[in-house]
Amino acid sequence: APSCPQNVNISGGTFTLSHGWAPGSLLTYSCPQGLYPSPASRLCKSSGQWQTPGATRSLSKAVCKPVRCPAPVSFENGIYTPRLGSYPVGGNVSFECEDGFILRGSPVRQCRPNGMWDGETAVCDNGAGHCPNPGISLGAVRTGFRFGHGDKVRYRCSSNLVLTGSSERECQGNGVWSGTEPICRQPYSYDFPEDVAPALGTSFSHMLGATNPTQKTKESLGRKIQIQRSGHLNLYLLLDCSQSVSENDFLIFKESASLMVDRIFSFEINVSVAIITFASEPKVLMSVLNDNSRDMTEVISSLENANYKDHENGTGTNTYAALNSVYLMMNNQMRLLGMETMAWQEIRHAIILLTDGKSNMGGSPKTAVDHIREILNINQKRNDYLDIYAIGVGKLDVDWRELNELGSKKDGERHAFILQDTKALHQVFEHMLDVSKLTDTICGVGNMSANASDQERTPWHVTIKPKSQETCRGALISDQWVLTAAHCFRDGNDHSLWRVNVGDPKSQWGKEFLIEKAVISPGFDVFAKKNQGILEFYGDDIALLKLAQKVKMSTHARPICLPCTMEANLALRRPQGSTCRDHENELLNKQSVPAHFVALNGSKLNINLKMGVEWTSCAEVVSQEKTMFPNLTDVREVVTDQFLCSGTQEDESPCKGESGGAVFLERRFRFFQVGLVSWGLYNPCLGSADKNSRKRAPRSKVPPPRDFHINLFRMQPWLRQHLGDVLNFLPL
């Protein structure tokens, strides 16, 4: 057979050949960082001629062109500078909001050498919608400007940019947009391993956390997750072995998959791993139906036995058949376990597709994904049971659109990636599941099912009491620390008499713990402003209790997520590099933020935290309280910016004994403490011995009810000072 000509140099770059100059060989160009090859590749045809994939005109000279990042097409409620058609590598774009709008995301973004912007999409939001303004990523055009429940927004990319993420998103009942943020990217762009590893890792860790909401430490094995329930994960690894993958690259695919297997088994969750290689046809090397799929050594051994030559007779890329073999495996397992059994329905499934190109035979891979979604009953409500990661390697013939179509779409997560080469892939798998970075206690997990007990719904909730009567409430923020209010401890300091009652699955009365030490904010002094006519002042009303023993994590005892920590960052599924400010913008993102506290009887009550201008009018009412503040001239002397304010309209008000308890909100089915109950103008339990009876304030009451809660975002220095070695704090 004729060989292809060798005059294929690229000025300023280099090239590699998959099979020399022979027909079927793929020539791949590469350029220094900040440049991209045009064309990216050529294929040696049986005629002895080079063909450029997708090219319409005859062979052009290969050149390295400068990478550029896409420009904003529109930016709502603000301005950006400089205004260019596209931006060079290293170039910045800055965003500012109009009055009345708050900037969420990155105020300044830089164009990176891979043609991608750093940071997060900048959005100017006034918090008016049911869902936050979803923004418009750079290079995108959005239609739809209403953000109420059920409203939809649609995105498309300008000019020749490719959309990854969701082209349509719907505002859901929980105030979160469906799908994942759309990003417009240059067709030649790719992802850096240092971005992919945490993105993949965050998503995977979230899935592992969902597979295993209750974990326990095995000291000898360091920080590892151990399944305590019936949760099970099926992991399907699909390795492209088509003609365009060189033997060396296939070896790296195998090594990367081995790393993944090794890492996933180190989590000690119940996992079964399937291994499938594919070209024109799939070859199942390990099925989840095989008991050996639960044995790490067997799985790795089957990977090692994967042979590049297994597919030499069929060299196309049949991604449909590979995914369909996963579907058939699922179908068989469903029949084996029984369609309606918990054993089948509670399995979570993760598919990792490693490919170097677009499918070029068989059916549409998307249809195979549809079949998989159908058999697993995946819909918006059961989205957690399936994750498909589509990873393209070698930015030559990888089809962004196809990868994006196959990858799962989940809010705050990415499932489709393109890496420059197999070395980058290896790096990703090495770093994506760094067990040491995962804490033993997954925070903010409450049981939301209708038949759960109050304590299972809010397992962080604790009662703090002296020998006699109950006084205060608090929240577990780790397995040994409780966050509460300082004013609970103003009557005497002998904590040896105090007890902390923590939830316990074995007893409806909970379990009592002694206090090893109480750290009370030195700034707290209820009489600090007496001489100004302020009879009681609750600034710095915050305290930490270290329990004498560690609490055993269970369905009834589990810490709540504290914002501004890595633990909360993982639960929020935010990217690495997020800051405390980012958490505040995400959690307190509206003028009126729905939140909760726990009542004396253990039930969860609703309040609305007022922010911005609504905070001012909420706090203003204090000036009408003449008994406690007889000659108050400035409300801010009493209600400093340390406080969150609630108690308007239909809000419940906390009772006296509920002080110190968490003020928390729910995001992505996880719970985050943003405040703690401190003081208020009305006690709904006054004069009632019954824990279940609360009296609403009469409408005519002057002043009307108002409640103030210590804002944890304003107490960061103090929290960091005392919890620095307990929790992993993010930069401010």
């Epitope: 998307k366 549809d370 159908e374 697993l376 009953n377």
Partner: antibody, heavy 125, light 106 residues
Framework: QVQLQQSGPGLVKPSQPLSLTCAIS??????????WSWIRQSPSRGLEWLGR?????????DYAVFVKSRMTINPDTSKNQFSLQLNSVTPEDTAVYYC???????????????WGQGILVTVSS | SYELTQPPSLSVSPGQTASITCSGH??????ACWYQQKPGQSPVLVIY???KRPSGIPERFSGSNSGNTATLTISGTQALDEADYYC?????????FGTGTKVTVL
């Protein structure tokens, strides 16, 4: 507006095949977003889904377990219709047979938004 | 196999609210829809994706779905609402219909 018009015999002898056709107007049988199903209804067993066909770069067919071995659904793109063939019928197969347009459960559309007028098929000698 | 159970019949006075339930294991994890069928006619979709109404369906029809139960509510029931109502969901490899509820407007 989508309309489905059914045709076929109202009486079939036991052990014979039952053949029905559903003509589509206002949509295409090879649409990339629709699925085309056959459903039947009898007083004893209520509504039962029998099977579906749909096109996504190639044709796919799915059948209910209880009729899988004797049922075929065929699309006909030239006439923009699809047909049902149920072999070896018994009196148990006596029912009103409907064709219907649905979406993909995978796309959160597991319902039928258009139905044919229905044909009562009696299996009797 | 998966089953959806409905009460066989329900009587309601004009102007009153009729609530029809549909029970199935973890039905709340699936999307439920509802069909209305009048004698001699084909079923008509009245609710899809738990609580959405197709165009042309009156606002008095509403739906909800959580836990093991989906509910179709007809508020201010009218004489022309007298019909059989069926719930339906998808389960892994098949479409499943409810047993049907006959609603009589007194």
């Amino acid at each position: 507006q989508v309309q489905l018009q059914q045709s076929g015999p109202g009486l079939v002898k036991p052990s014979q095949p039952l053949s029905l056709t559903c003509a589509i107007s206002g949509d295409s049988v090879s649409s990339n977003s629709a699925t085309w199903s056959w459903i039947r209804q009898s007083p004893s067993r209520g509504l039962e889904w029998l099977g579906r066909t749909y096109y996504r770069s190639k044709w796919y067919h799915d059948y209910a377990v209880f009729v899988k071995s004797r049922m075929t659904i065929n699309p006909d793109t030239s006439k923009n219709q699809f047909s049902l063939q149920l072999n070896s019928v018994t009196p148990e197969d006596t029912a009103v047979y409907y064709c219907a347009r649905g979406g993909m459960p995978a796309s959160d559309i597991p319902h039928f938004d258009n139905w044919g007028q229905g044909i009562l098929v009696t299996v009797s000698s | 196999s998966y089953e959806l159970t409905q009460p066989p019949s329900l009587s309601v006075s004009p102007g009153q609210t009729a609530s029809i339930t549909c029970s199935g294991h973890k039905l709340g994890d699936k999307y439920a829809c509802w069909y209305q069928q009048k004698p001699g006619q084909s079923p008509v979709l009245v609710i899809y994706q738990d609580n959405k109404r197709p165009s042309g369906i009156p606002e008095r029809f509403s739906g909800s779905n959580s836990g093991n139960t989906a509910t179709l509510t007809i508020s201010g029931t009218q004489a022309l609402d007298e019909a059989d109502y069926y719930c339906q969901a998808w389960d892994s490899i098949t479409y499943v219909f409810g047993t049907g509820t006959k609603v009589t407007v007194l």
